[in-house]
Interface confidence: low
């Protein structure tokens, strides 16, 4: 069988065998090697010589197989925009950023560019759990039966009502979505406002 041609090789149909790692150079009508992630083109290919690649300098990167003549500058995660760094820039990958705790991504342009404060969920509700933190603003849902949440907060979770009997106490007032059960000592009299409601 024919040995596989190695770049640079002629291509009449303007396509290359390995689209990820090769590119078509129209001036010479040849396929040349792309440079691997973390490198850039320091000398373009010709009919007799393949692409020459060089490593990206400190504080710059290229993420993909490329035929770029420069590396991209690393950019910071801007705290003014509500972003924080989760992984530093390397020669092969840009700085990885995410929204700071308590914030969500308000502006996307291929990646998050601007975070805003999550809105509070009122008492009796909690933020619906999302697959990915920081992806969207809070959607508040009511506490399920037997649970309560008594603050205005972007992150507070509904908690189960206290079971008075587990503590050797009796219920003085039932829990609501916004407040916990009130327990009392079995020997204590009921508060006056409750006394008329008890059937003996």
């Amino acid at each position: 069988s024919q040995p596989q041609a190695v770049p640079p090789y002629a291509s009449e149909n303007q396509t290359c065998r390995d689209q990820e790692k090769e590119y078509y150079e129209p001036q010479h009508r040849i396929c040349c090697s792309r440079c691997p992630p973390g490198t850039y083109v320091s000398a373009k290919c010709s009919r007799i010589r393949d692409t020459v690649c060089a490593t990206c300098a400190e504080n710059s990167y290229n993420e993909h197989w490329n035929y770029l003549t420069i590396c991209q500058l690393c950019r910071p995660c801007d705290p003014v925009m509500g972003l924080e760094e989760i992984a530093p820039c390397t020669s092969k990958r840009k700085t990885q950023c995410r929204c700071q705790p308590g914030m969500f991504c308000a502006a996307w342009a291929l990646e998050c560019t601007h975070c805003e404060l999550l809105s509070d969920c009122p008492p009796g509700t909690e933020a619906e759990l999302k697959d990915e933190v920081g992806k969207g603003n809070n959607h508040c849902v009511p506490c399920k039966a037997g649970h309560f949440q008594n603050t205005s907060s972007p992150s507070a979770r509904c908690q189960p009502h206290t079971r008075c009997e587990n503590q050797g106490l009796v219920e003085a007032a039932p829990g609501t979505a916004q407040s916990d059960t009130t327990c009392k000592n079995p020997l204590e009299p009921l508060p006056p406002e409750m006394s008329g409601t008890m059937l003996m």
């Epitope: 504080n59 710059s60 420069i70 801007d78 705290p79």
Partner: antibody, heavy 120, light 106 residues
């Protein structure tokens, strides 16, 4: 070649507004942010804010939030900054400068600046 | 807010001298720093970006270095046309310029 054209001087009375322009040639402002920088007489440089001309999104420093309004017109490739409620300490040179795809965080190109004089 | 302090505020040197200008950030700015030159009556001119990358068209006698909070602009052999004010500018957590160093010829 990227060039930025600003008018040399503007005169404003205290309490009024003035609108500065920054016309860009040789580069589509849709691929940039346009930034504005102030330099008071004999002083250093201070960043005011920037606009993304494609969507009109702006960011200004706290100090200039109620002072500067940034706009842009893609059809004329021009950015504008309106300064309101002029006071004597707004007397300064105002520069516009784009950040481009190749220089995303540095100002490689500058307008020549507009000198704003506030005087009654 | 991160403050940028330049020193000295003024400097007098002779043609051919090696000159070092300093810029100090109040906290780590992770090499996100640029240097500009401004002559009287002109707009600033970008010399160095990202701490040590020489802008196209700038003479190689200019160089930048530093990390963390401390950064330096060096002119290896001072020329008469280098008389100007030099500003550093950080772009980590917003854009802030230093107060400037005025460089004069002896």
């Amino acid at each position: 070649e990227v060039q930025l054209q600003q008018y040399g001087a503007e005169l404003g009375k205290p309490g009024t507004s003035v609108k500065l322009s920054c016309k860009v040639s040789g580069y589509n402002i849709g691929n940039t942010y346009i930034h504005w920088v102030i330099q008071r007489p004999g002083k250093g440089l201070e960043w005011i804010g920037r606009i993304d001309p494609t969507n009109g999104n702006t960011i200004c420093t706290e100090k200039f939030k109620n002072k500067a309004t940034l706009t842009a017109d893609l059809s004329s490739n021009t950015a504008y900054m309106q300064l309101s409620q002029l006071k004597s300490d707004d007397t300064a040179i105002y520069f516009c400068a784009p950040t481009t795809l190749t220089t995303p965080d540095s100002f490689a190109y500058w307008g020549q600046g507009t000198l704003v004089t506030v005087s009654s | 807010d991160i403050q940028m302090t330049q020193s000295p505020s003024q400097l007098s040197a002779s043609v051919g001298d090696r000159v070092t200008l300093s810029c100090k950030a109040s906290q780590n700015i992770y090499k996100y720093l640029n240097w500009y030159q401004q002559k009287l009556g002109e707009a600033p001119r970008l010399l160095i970006y990202s701490t040590n990358i020489l802008q196209t068209g700038i003479p190689s006698r200019f160089s930048g270095s530093g990390s963390g909070t401390d950064y330096t602009l060096t002119i290896s052999s001072l020329q008469p046309e280098d008389a100007a004010t030099y500003f550093c500018q950080k772009y980590y957590s917003g854009f802030t310029f230093g107060s400037g160093t005025k460089l004069e010829m002896k």
